[in-house]
């Protein structure tokens, strides 16, 4: 009967997803077999995020309608390991849009989810940001530093990296 | 007073050459992006190229990619556009404008008098 | 790309009557509560010139009898008391996403 239970909760939950998502990759978590997490099948995981590369090109508003459409956003890296995650699926001579803008061209950047802006977990290329008409951030690669952040016109169409919370089920 | 004004205009024979300037005064040229526009005779407006302040990054529409290099020298506030493989179809008066960023988008808001090319054999 | 489409054509007002110009995108230009649609005037022989940006927002030194309204895919461009000195083709333009491209024109002529 328990187990009846937690199959119809974890149908439903299902269900709510199947809309954007219809298939997802579910991988037990630790030792108890009624605890699963889940991203959307072919999205990668990393962490407690799901993350998806988009290769459409497409300015950066419309990249972040895009993320939102699949309930996920532009991707807000936190830390250098989630970076170095990252960037083992992207390619070098591409360019990706990540959650990251500074509308108001005052070099105040924020992130797509409020995650606070820190000074200190930044990885923008040497010299960048260099421009204050340029108010969405990329990741790209240099063959002088190899991957980093630098800033760019947001009406540019580039592609970009989706990130969304995992499917607990 | 923003001035901008274009040069180097001309008739030429499908499949050759020009460079075009604009020459700006009346603001800090260095710290602007800039932007090209032309004007088919009796048509509407097509964006042609946008170069940011630095130079080190350029953006053209499909029509013109490959043919068209946007560059800048800010020692000398001058804009150009060196215009390569001409066409038949890139006849028009040609316009270099100031962008002005908006938020996510951005507007053009100060236009020199335009340059005329006209490419016929 | 997005297109733009513009209408009417061609409008012939009376002085001190409203004139009004519809443009349709062929996709949302919106984002964040901005809406990226820009106006622009010009007249014969001369440079296009700005007039309104971010759908409705008033340019330095423009007459306050030019507004713009309209978000998403649909935008219009308002002259409320038409002037002899109106007379001019008027563009739309989006700068949502690259390439920019712009409406096709409306001349704005005195019946």
């Known amino acids: 009967n328990f187990m009846y239970s937690k199959t119809v909760k974890r149908l439903s939950k299902l269900r709510e997803y199947q809309q954007y998502h219809p298939s997802l990759t579910c991988v037990m978590e630790g030792k108890d077999i009624e605890d699963w997490s889940c991203c959307p099948t072919p999205w990668t995981s990393f962490q407690s995020s799901c993350y998806f590369i988009s290769t459409g090109m497409q300015s950066w508003t419309k990249s972040q309608k895009n993320c939102s459409v699949m309930g996920a956003d532009l991707v807000v890296i936190n830390t250098r390991e989630e970076q170095d995650f990252i960037i083992q699926n992207l390619k070098r001579n591409s360019s990706y849009f990540l959650g990251l803008s500074d509308p108001g061209g005052r070099r105040h950047w924020q992130w797509v989810d409020q995650t606070p802006y820190n000074e200190n977990v930044t990885f923008w290329h040497s010299g960048e940001p260099n421009n204050l008409d340029e108010r969405c951030a990329i990741i790209n690669f240099r063959s002088s530093e190899e991957w980093g952040w630098n800033d760019i016109h947001c009406h540019v169409p580039q592609k970009s990296i989706c990130k969304m919370k995992k499917i607990y089920i | 007073e923003v001035q901008l004004l274009e040069s180097g205009g001309g008739l030429v024979q499908p499949g050759g050459s020009l460079r075009l300037s604009c020459a700006a005064s009346?603001?800090?040229?260095?710290?602007?992006?800039m932007s090209w526009v032309r004007q088919a005779p009796g048509k509407g407006l097509e964006w042609v190229s946008t170069i940011n302040s630095g130079g080190d990054n350029t953006y053209y529409p499909d029509s013109v990619k490959g043919r068209f290099t946007i560059s800048r020298d800010n020692s000398k506030n001058t804009l150009y556009l060196q215009m390569n493989s001409l066409r038949a179809e890139d006849t028009a008066v040609y316009y270099c404008?100031?962008?002005?960023?908006?938020?996510?988008?951005?507007?053009?808001?100060?236009w020199g008098q335009g340059t005329t090319v006209t490419v016929s054999s | 790309d997005i297109v733009m489409t513009q209408s009417p054509d061609s409008l012939a007002v009376s002085l001190g009557e409203r004139a009004t110009i519809n443009c349709k995108a062929s996709?949302?230009?919106?984002?964040?509560?901005?809406?990226?649609v820009n106006w622009y005037q010009q007249k014969p022989g001369q440079p296009p010139k700005l007039l309104i940006y971010g759908a409705s927002n008033l340019e330095s030194g423009i007459p306050d009898r030019f507004s713009g309204s309209g978000s998403g895919t649909d935008f219009t461009l308002t002259i409320s008391s038409l002037q002899a000195e109106d007379v001019a083709v008027y563009y739309c333009q989006q700068s949502d996403e690259d390439p920019w491209t712009f409406g096709g024109g409306t001349k704005v002529e005195i019946k």
């Open positions: 009346g603001f800090t040229f260095s710290t602007y992006t």
């Open positions: 404008a100031t962008y002005r960023p908006y938020y996510y988008g951005s507007v053009l808001d100060y």
């Open positions: 996709q949302s230009v919106d984002y964040d509560g901005n809406s990226y």
